[in-house]
Structure formats: C-alpha cells, structure tokens
C-alpha cells in the first residue's frame, strides 16, 4: 500500500465507556490532527475507514458492521456502539484517504464494567463547588448527539449509591444537579443516569462525576504568614544551625499560582555566597486552602550571617505579601568562673 | 557553573515512548521547581508542568496531562519527562527550565530535539 | 485558561528608532513576564513582574502595563535586539505564553 501519515497511537483521549449502553466516538483525526472538516473530506472525495485491533492482539482487522441490530455503525465520522460489550475494548483507527491521499490515527477504546452503586475504574471529572455561595449547578456530561432534540428522556440522580430525592440541599432538575448551598458534607460522586427510547429499544447513559467543595473566592485573601512573625527571635550563635520556617496560608482560588520565596539582604539565596538549602513541603484543608512552608537553612552560620535580612515573601492571584524574619547573635554568657576570680581580684 | 543540561536529540518510532532528562548541577537541586516547555518548529513556547524536586510535588497543563509524566532523582539532580504514545505532533525541542518563587525561569537547558518519525 | 495575544506577530525597526509591542491578556493578570529568543538557541529571562529588567538586559528595555495590557518598549533599536520576544502570565495554571512578537531589523 502507498505512504500513509500515521498519526500513531492517540493516548491523549484515553476513551472509556461502560458495558452495555451506548458509545458514540469521533474520529480524533478531524479534531486535532487535521486543518479540515469531516464534510470537506467527504466532498473532496475522502474515504473514512474504520479497522480495530482487539485487546492483547497485534491483528488489524475491519470492524463488523455487519452485527445484528447494527450493533456497530458509522455515520459521518462518528463510531457508534449501541450497545457496547466488553471485548470491544482494543486501539481502534480511522483512515481517510482516497487514491493520491491517507492519514490515520488510533486511539485506545476501553469498555468499562461498573457495578450497582456505579463504581468502576472508570476515570472521574471534578466539579469543583464553592463552599456556601449559593445556588450552584452540575451538569449531566457528555450525552450531546446520543438522541434527537425531540426525544424527552428520563434522568435519575445520584449520590454514591442512593438516589437524589427529598436532600436538605440538593435538587435534581432534568440534566442539572442544583446545589442550594454547598457543605463539605456534599463531597462525593454523583450520577446521572439518562434513559431514552430508541427504535424500539431502551437504553442507558451513566455519567459520575466527582463533586469537591472548595473554598470560597468571596472568603478568599491575600497570602497570610504564619512565620516569620514579631514573636520568635532566631538568635543563633556563630557555627550553628540556622533553620528558618516561613509558613504561608493561602485561601483557595480556582487555578492561582501560589508562591514562596526567601529573599537575603533583597538576592535570591542562590545568589548570596552562602551554603544556603531551602526545602519546601505542601498541605491542603479540607476546603483545598493551602499551607506551603519553606524552610531555609544554613548548616553553620557566620556572624556576617547573622548581620542579614532574611525576608519571606508570598504571592496569589490575590496579592503580595513579605515578612522579615527576627536574626540576632547570641551576645555569649559570662564564663562565671573567670569573670568572677577577677571580680575578688585573683591574679 | 549553573546550569541545566539535557542530551541534543533523540529519534523514536510513533507509538514508542521516551525519556528525557534534564540534570542539575551548580545550585541546590531541591531548592527550585523544574519545569518543561513544548516548542514545535517555528512556533511559540507550550507549557507542560512543573515539579518540584523537595517533595515530589507536579502540576500539569491539562492538555498534557495523558501525555507526560514528571519525576526527579535527587541523588543525581536530575529531572525526568517521560513521554508516552508518540506521534508526529509531539516532534518539537522540549526544555527544561526551574523557578524560585518570583524568579520565573531564569535558568533554562539548551533543549532536546525529539523527532517522532517511523 | 488565559490567552495572551501579542501584537505585532512580526515587526521590523531601523537602529535607533523607539519599538513598542503589547501582550493582551484574556483575562486579569497581576504581572506580566518577557522572554527573549534568538534563532536555534533558548528562551532568556528578560522582563519579570511587568517591569524588573533581568540580569544583563540594557537599560534601553522597559515593560509597564497592568490589568490585561502590557507592553514591552525599546527607546532605541539596537541590531542585537532583533529576535522574538514572548509575554508569559504566571498568576494562573496553567502558565501560557504568547505567540511572539518577532522583531527584525531594517
């Protein structure tokens, strides 16, 4: 056969569907490798062709669509699978090409079982929630070109295993979850289960989604520093260990970057001739507020070392904020024997 | 001498993955993020994600999220991107570059040239 | 995620002449950053926190803006200054670039 651009293997949608209800795929081809549509291709005379390799096997073999019931179908540049079985799982490719032309990408397909309370290994969207800020709404995903605009189907919700009916705060309205008023107790998984009829036949969509409450940007603030702060003094003689904590508290806010950083004598420590570490750790609350501290360290201080300015600085989305640490020299306790043999005048 | 240094080029078949490396030297290794930056040729500069070498912690751009993997090796300084399932569009010069705090990318490695070709 | 759109994509100057190019951001950034390259070799650090020239960068180059405008300014176009400069935002994740502004001398 002629030269073909192989796109390889398309791991960046790593699709998965559940056993026995319906799939519908689109070529990747026209969505992210090719500048043209499906229906240019089609006018220019482009052929698109569906083949498969099963699970654990190297054989590319053409789809059957030739099942009963149409259980596979094309139509236009979208697979469909109504409904799917377990072993349709495998790398499933479509080419287009026509006499002078090919392309083609595969992709991986993995059918999915869930059991009766929804759990799988399916992997899960999250919706993130701000904590107590109002009527806030989840939609059902990803059930766009499953039936026609005149088809009515029937949705039923649900939180973990039980289903959404009478909550305190939580109302199902067709495809939307509403959230009357968010708590940390409304963290879960939530399931839409869309049922419609299909010539003749029923079938199910199920959709979950994982629901975080997070903080709220109407409580958010700017960086807080915990340490350095007036109250510790870091007094340290010369030849020990200086350890300065510089602890921050960041209030969530959707996609900031938070950062942490020390400045000595107004230089990044790198830039100071001294054998400066700084090790970082991170903790989120329940809420996903952040707490970053930066502890800076040097093994063994100099007095010039301890003449610095040792400054902790932080900034989010929501401000800047800095903080200079408290460093002294330990003035060194009378040595009492000798001070005080000269005190009695002892020669 | 501060520096990030990361091997010239490497050559993989689509479907295949790869690691590239980015080492360390002249600089606490644990004191700065590492991050890695897509440039396809001839366009502009995509960022991937980040790590952070003290306690392993990653951020990654979502659109990269099924494509690589960070990871660092203290006792060599050196960080890792492993990029899996390659096509042709993942051809492009990966760099590795670190920040502290407020001080975004100051040091950046020279740039692996990864050529997906069959 | 925040899309930054530079402007002009490319632009050419005679030596001397004053230079200016803009960044828009899609949405509030609190600083802007500048990156600088030259063909085959890598990004240099040139601008940070809308304004603060990087180590090395002549005094000729200053950025200012704020909101979702920035821009970068060169009083006076020197050939070394040909290369393509990029804005980068770092106040949201993910952190994106622009697509650079190429500058060429006349």
């Known amino acids: 056969s002629e030269r073909c651009d192989d796109w390889g293997l398309d791991t960046m949608r790593q699709i998965q569907v559940f056993e026995d209800e319906p799939a519908r795929i689109k070529c990747p081809l026209f969505e992210h490798f090719l500048k043209f549509n499906y229906s240019t291709a089609h006018s220019a005379g482009l052929t698109l062709i569906w083949y498969w390799t099963r699970q654990d096997r190297d054989l590319e073999e053409p789809i059957n669509f030739r099942l009963p019931e149409n259980r596979i179908s094309k139509e236009k540049d979208v697979l469909w699978f109504r409904p799917t079985l377990l072993n349709d799982t495998g790398n499933y490719t479509c080419m287009l090409r026509n006499t002078t032309y090919c392309s083609k990408v595969a992709f991986p397909l993995e059918v999915v079982q869930k059991d009766s309370c929804f759990n799988s290994p399916m992997k899960l969207p999250v919706h993130k929630l701000y904590i107590e800020y109002g009527i806030q709404r989840i939609t059902c995903p990803n059930v766009d070109g499953y039936f026609p605009s005149s088809v009515k189907p029937t949705i039923t919700w649900y939180m973990g295993c039980y289903k959404i009916q009478n909550f305190n705060n939580v109302i199902p309205e067709g495809m939307n979850l509403s959230f009357l008023i968010a708590l940390i107790s409304n963290n879960g998984n939530y399931t839409c289960v869309v049922t419609y009829p299909e010539n003749g036949r029923t079938f199910h969509l199920t959709r979950t989604l994982t629901v975080k409450v997070v903080g709220s940007p109407k409580n958010a603030v700017p960086p807080v520093i915990h340490s350095p702060n007036d109250h510790v003094v870091y007094e340290k003689e010369p030849g020990e260990e200086l350890l300065i904590p510089c602890t921050v508290y960041f209030s969530f806010l959707m996609d900031s970057r938070n950062e942490v950083w020390w400045t000595i004598d107004g230089k990044k420590p790198d830039d100071i001739t001294i054998d400066v570490t700084i090790n970082e750790s991170i903790s989120h609350s329940r809420t996903e507020d952040e707490t970053r501290t930066q502890i800076l360290s040097i093994k063994k201080v100099t007095s010039e070392d301890l003449k610095r300015s040792y400054v902790c600085h932080a900034r989010s989305a929501k401000g800047e904020v800095a903080k200079a640490a408290k460093v002294k020299q330990k003035v060194p306790a009378p040595r009492y024997t000798v001070e005080l043999a000269c005190g009695f005048g002892a020669t | 001498q501060v520096q990030l240094q990361q091997p010239g080029a490497e050559l993989v078949k689509p479907g295949a993955s790869v690691t590239l490396s980015c080492e360390a030297s002249?600089?606490?290794?644990?004191?700065?993020?590492i991050h890695w930056v897509k440039q396809r040729p001839g366009q502009g500069l995509e960022w991937i994600g980040e790590i952070n070498p003290s306690h392993g912690h990653t951020t990654y751009n979502e659109k990269f999220k099924n494509k690589a993997t960070l990871t660092v090796d203290k006792s060599s300084s050196t960080a890792y991107m492993q990029v899996s399932s390659l096509t042709s569009e993942d051809s492009a010069v990966y760099y590795c570059t670190r920040h502290y705090g407020s001080y975004y990318f100051d040091l950046w490695g020279q740039g692996t040239t990864l050529t997906v070709s069959s | 995620q925040i899309v930054l759109t530079q402007s002009p994509a490319i632009m050419s100057a005679f030596p001397g002449e004053k230079v200016t190019m803009t960044c828009r951001a899609s949405s509030s950034v609190s600083y802007m950053h500048w990156y600088r390259q030259k063909s085959g070799t890598f990004p240099k650090r040139w601008i940070y926190?809308?304004?603060k020239l990087a180590s090395g960068v002549p005094a000729r180059f200053s950025g200012s803006g704020s909101g979702t405008s920035y821009s970068l300014t060169i009083s006076s176009m020197e050939a070394e200054d040909a290369a393509t400069y990029y804005c980068q935002q770092w106040s949201t994740n993910p952190i994106t670039f622009g697509a650079g502004t190429k500058l060429e001398l006349k």
């Open positions: 002249g600089y606490t290794f644990t004191s700065y993020w």
């Open positions: 926190d809308t304004s």
